[in-house]
Amino acid sequence: AQHVTTQLVLRNKGVYESVKYIQQENFWIGPSSIDLIHLGAKFSPCIRKDQQIEQLVLRERDLERDSGCCVQNDHSGCIQTQRKDCSETLATFVKWQDDTGPPMDKSDLGQKRTSGAVCHQDPRTCEEPASSGAHIWPDDITKWPICTEQAKSNRTGFLHMDCQIKGRPCCISTKGSCEITTREYCEFMHGYFHEEATLCSQVHCLDKVCGLLPFLNPEVPDQFYRLWLS
């Protein structure tokens, strides 16, 4: 059986949309599947790598690598999207390409970044972890760390940094899929909203879905002990 909830929820484009949340009901009347997984149920994606989920994550990453920051021209906010999802008339799509990207580092002026820009994250304005020396962030945004400390500046002069961010990674469903969404939409979908991150590649949704002890390597499920828990 399914339980359907419909509600007007604030979406990425800054408008309220009617959204359906479909919850698979427990046949025996009890905890939901998400709760059961958290309690230690035998859920194979938490025990070993699941090919289907792995393919989903890789597909999400490939899309994210090509994303940019969609900044609304009316200064209402910005969100990380694909070019096709960013209005050509109402917004500006900030994407480094060809020769427009910043240099990888002040020590290497010739090599330009082509992956990015990312809403509210830039190697030139992140103090911790700083992109310098032996720790220059790679030219692949899906390999960027979470910036834990931004440079103290009210305005950076960068369009993708000075906007109000409207969406962050949200882990939705037992499959551990990730979407950049508003907090409101994420909460309605019973997802896990990552306030600290800017990209889906920075969060490990399956680790959140599984709960219990975190995976030793966030990319590799290792909860073999579930076989004895349930």
């Epitope: 002040k106 020590s107 310098s132 440079a151 305005r155």
Partner: antibody, heavy 123, light 106 residues
Framework: QVTLKESGPGILQPSQTLSLTCSFS??????????VGWIRQPSGKGLEWLTN???????YYNSVLKSRLTISKDTSKNQVFLKIANVDTADTATYYC???????????????WGTGTTVTVSS | QIVLTQSPAIMSASPGEKVTMTCSAS?????MYWYQQKPGSSPRVLIY???NLSSGVPVRFSGSGSGTSYSLTISRMEAEDAATYYC?????????FGAGTKLELK
């Protein structure tokens, strides 16, 4: 308000070491992304970049003059220093220090310049 | 090193006249920066990232170009624009400036 002021000996003899100081206010070189550069200009001629120093103590020099240049900073005193060893009459010029804009540009640029100090190398 | 060649070396213009000067790079650069220097004064930045106007710079100034060819335009010359203009690149070390274009008032 950001200001920079250069100071130096004014006149010195060939083979001596030129020591210049750039004293600044309105910003700190301990601030992430900040930098200061030195540029010189012989009288009636164009601008020549010499060196940059950054908040993280990274230093970059003009390769043509690198063996003679040394840049350093005293963050607590808001000062940057430049030494040019073994000077020659060709080093006679007005020396400018300039702040490097930390943000806003895809690269960087010299957004605020000092008034310059004139140095004459003469025997 | 990247050599920047500015032309013309000297030019004159009447008030209200449109002025265009160019900067040619010996190899491709990503962006160009333009500075204005008046006699007895230090340089000040006019344009950064090829076409962005620095704060406080009149809108009659504009920059354009890409690759090896860049230009600075003054839409309507004013007396206070008489100065020497330098282009500068930050695409590779050593950082280099052009030799300058001296703009005189006719």
């Amino acid at each position: 308000q950001v200001t920079l002021k250069e100071s130096g000996p004014g006149i010195l003899q060939p083979s001596q070491t030129l020591s210049l100081t750039c004293s600044f206010s309105g910003f700190s070189l301990s601030t992430f992304g900040m930098g200061v550069g030195w540029i010189r200009q012989p009288s009636g001629k164009g601008l020549e970049w010499l060196t940059n120093i950054w908040w993280d103590d990274d230093k970059y020099y003009n390769s043509v003059l690198k063996s003679r240049l040394t840049i350093s900073k005293d963050t607590s005193k808001n000062q940057v220093f430049l030494k040019i060893a073994n000077v020659d009459t060709a080093d006679t010029a007005t020396y400018y220090c300039a702040r490097i804009a930390a943000y806003g540009s895809n690269y960087w640029y010299f957004d605020v310049w000092g008034t310059g100090t004139t140095v004459t190398v003469s025997s | 090193q990247i050599v920047l060649t500015q032309s013309p070396a000297i030019m004159s213009a009447s008030p209200g006249e449109k002025v265009t000067m160019t900067c040619s790079a010996s190899s491709s650069v990503s962006y160009m920066y333009w500075y204005q220097q008046k006699p007895g004064s230090s340089p000040r930045v006019l344009i950064y990232d090829t076409s962005n106007l620095s704060s406080g710079v009149p809108v009659r100034f504009s920059g354009s170009g890409s690759g090896t060819s860049y230009s600075l335009t003054i839409s309507r010359m004013e007396a206070e624009d008489a100065a020497t203009y330098y282009c500068q690149q930050w695409s590779s070390y050593p950082l280099t400036f052009g030799a300058g274009t001296k703009l005189e008032l006719k």
